[in-house]
């Protein structure tokens, strides 16, 4: 006859492990008892349980309440046991010793492997600002047994570096993702992916990138100077910029206070019907926590009468 078992039994921490031991006998052989023991190298054998064909299961005190036989129907040649609620300390070598009649004793060993699934954590790096060099965007750490795999899933261009720390029964892996911050990265997901044999599927933690920046400011509204004439209604200047965090806008006049009747509405400066006193140099001041920008324009309000006179002069001059 021969014993049929597994070389390795793998179980996730906290789950139950079936330790297989099946005697495939020759004609008429019977199993009298099956003894299970833990037999780690360098240590004496520690008895788990004894399965007796007549007297049933006896569990040693150290494993009381943790070792059971499979539920019936049970093949009398099946000496398998169930080890409940596996802990890391259960990892190691086990031996089943089968006493048969009339063939004698047989023994087989298996290794119990207890997987400890990781609980990953993601830590964002320092605030990202456009113009910085290579900067830590995030680090991801996962500890388990065996060592987990930590990778990154993102469309963002960057570099990764990993390091591992071995503990007595587990290993911690930390992976860092570095990048050169640019505004195009804003709002992009950076996902830490942790793989481990104890996980049914990869664990994913996503961090949304925030890159502080402030674009150059410019002012729109003066594209056609001829529109800026006395009496025109609805004239406005709009300050263009963008940033993260979103910027705030402030309007001033370089050569004096803002004329009465001029309305400031965020990025827009609204004018009442234009008069010559609206001529001047206007400054849009854009700022956020990251930076500030200025853009200035000169408004020259035309007097149509003056203009037409000039045109006549020009014509007469020709």
């Amino acid at each position: 006859g021969e014993l049929e078992t597994s070389d390795v039994v793998t179980v996730v921490l906290g789950q139950d492990a079936k330790l297989p031991c099946f005697y495939r006998g020759d004609s008429g052989e019977q199993v009298g008892q099956v003894a299970w023991a833990r037999v780690d190298a360098g240590e004496g054998a520690q008895e788990l349980a004894l399965l007796h064909s007549k007297y049933g299961l006896h569990v040693s005190p150290a494993y009381e309440g943790r070792v059971e036989q499979p539920p019936p129907p049970r093949n009398p040649l099946d000496g398998s046991v169930l080890l409940r609620n596996a802990v890391q300390a259960d990892e190691g070598e086990y031996e089943c010793r089968v006493s048969t009649f009339p063939a004698g004793s047989f023994q087989a060993r298996l290794r119990l492997r207890v997987l400890v699934p990781p609980l990953p954590s993601l830590n964002p790096g320092p605030a990202l600002e456009e113009g910085q060099g290579l900067t830590l965007a995030a680090s991801c750490t996962a500890e388990g047994s065996p060592a987990p795999s930590v990778t990154w899933d993102t469309e963002v261009k960057g570099t990764t570096s990993s390091r591992s720390f071995k503990h007595s029964r587990s290993a911690a892996v930390t992976s860092e993702f570095h990048l050169v911050p640019s505004r195009s990265m804003n709002g992009q997901p950076l996902t830490c992916v942790v793989s481990h044999p104890g996980l049914l599927q990869d664990q994913r933690i996503t961090h949304i990138l925030h890159v502080s920046f402030l674009a150059e400011a410019s002012v729109r509204g003066l594209e056609d100077q001829n529109l800026w004439h006395i009496g025109r209604e609805g004239a406005m200047l709009k300050c263009l910029s963008e940033g993260q965090p979103p910027p705030s806008y402030n309007w001033t006049r370089l050569d004096g206070p803002l004329p009465s009747g001029v309305r400031v509405d965020g990025d827009t400066l609204g004018f009442p019907p234009l008069t010559t006193e609206h001529s001047g140099i206007y400054v849009c001041h854009v700022s956020n926590e990251f930076s500030s920008r200025d853009s200035q324009v000169t408004v020259d309000v035309l007097d149509p009468q003056e203009d037409s006179g000039k045109q006549v002069d020009l014509v007469s001059a020709s």
Epitope: D26, Q30, P70, P73, N75
Partner: antibody, heavy 116, light 106 residues
């Protein structure tokens, strides 16, 4: 070559008994157990019981009061007997050789109709 | 008794395709699971035992996987002879079978 051949009646009167013999070849009943399973359109496949290589038996709790399985190792035969059959026992009855936690060879099946 | 829920109940596929049939146990069965194929008018035939082990003579396009309560049978590159009904069965306590998956040619 492993074979299991079944013999038994096709028609059984209600409340009567069903007896099927499973004759095996290519292996010894002292080394392998034999399971009994039935299949019906209404209930699908149902495990009924097993006789192990050492001669001990286990039965499905739903049939324990009216089922017995025995064997004659020297003749390589396993005997299946079920009492008090009713119409819902109409099914195909199979014997099958035990592999560790599986059935690796099946008989051809015995189609049983329970009807008066 | 432990219940075995098999899905899908039927599927229609073409030769050369890959299919996966799943079986969910109502509690942990510790990989004590077998898969069988049955063709019309024939007895079931063992394909996989102990969740992952191919029975003798079974082509390598068949593979079993799973643990705990979730198990699956995968058939790569289906051949015409693979069509039939597939059953899972557990052996942890009173054995019970899944309801079957009928695999038909599209």
């Amino acid at each position: 070559q492993v074979q299991l051949k079944q013999s038994g009646p096709g028609l059984v009167q209600p409340s009567q008994s069903l007896s099927i013999t499973c004759t095996v070849s290519g292996f010894s009943l002292t080394n392998y157990g034999v399971h009994w399973v039935r299949q019906s359109p209404g209930k699908g496949l149902e495990w009924l019981g097993v006789i192990w290589s050492g001669g001990s038996t286990d039965y499905n709790a739903a049939f324990i009061s009216r089922l017995s399985i025995s064997k004659d190792t020297s003749k390589s035969q396993v005997f299946f007997k079920m009492n008090s059959l009713q119409a819902d026992d109409t099914a195909i009855y199979y014997c099958a050789r035990e592999l560790i936690h599986a059935m690796d060879n099946w008989g051809q099946g015995t189609s049983v109709t329970v009807s008066s | 008794d432990i219940q075995m829920t098999q899905s899908p109940a039927s599927l229609s596929v073409s030769v050369g395709e890959t299919v996966t049939i799943t079986c969910r146990a109502s509690e942990n069965i510790y990989s004590n699971l077998a898969w069988y194929q049955q063709k019309q008018g024939n007895s079931p035939q063992l394909l996989v035992f102990a969740a992952t082990n191919l029975a003798d003579g079974v082509p390598s396009r068949f593979s079993g996987s799973g643990s705990g309560t979730q198990y699956s049978l995968k058939i790569n590159s289906l051949q015409s002879e693979d069509f039939g009904t597939y059953y899972c069965q557990h052996f942890w306590g009173t054995p019970t079978f899944g309801g079957g998956t009928k695999l038909e040619i599209k």
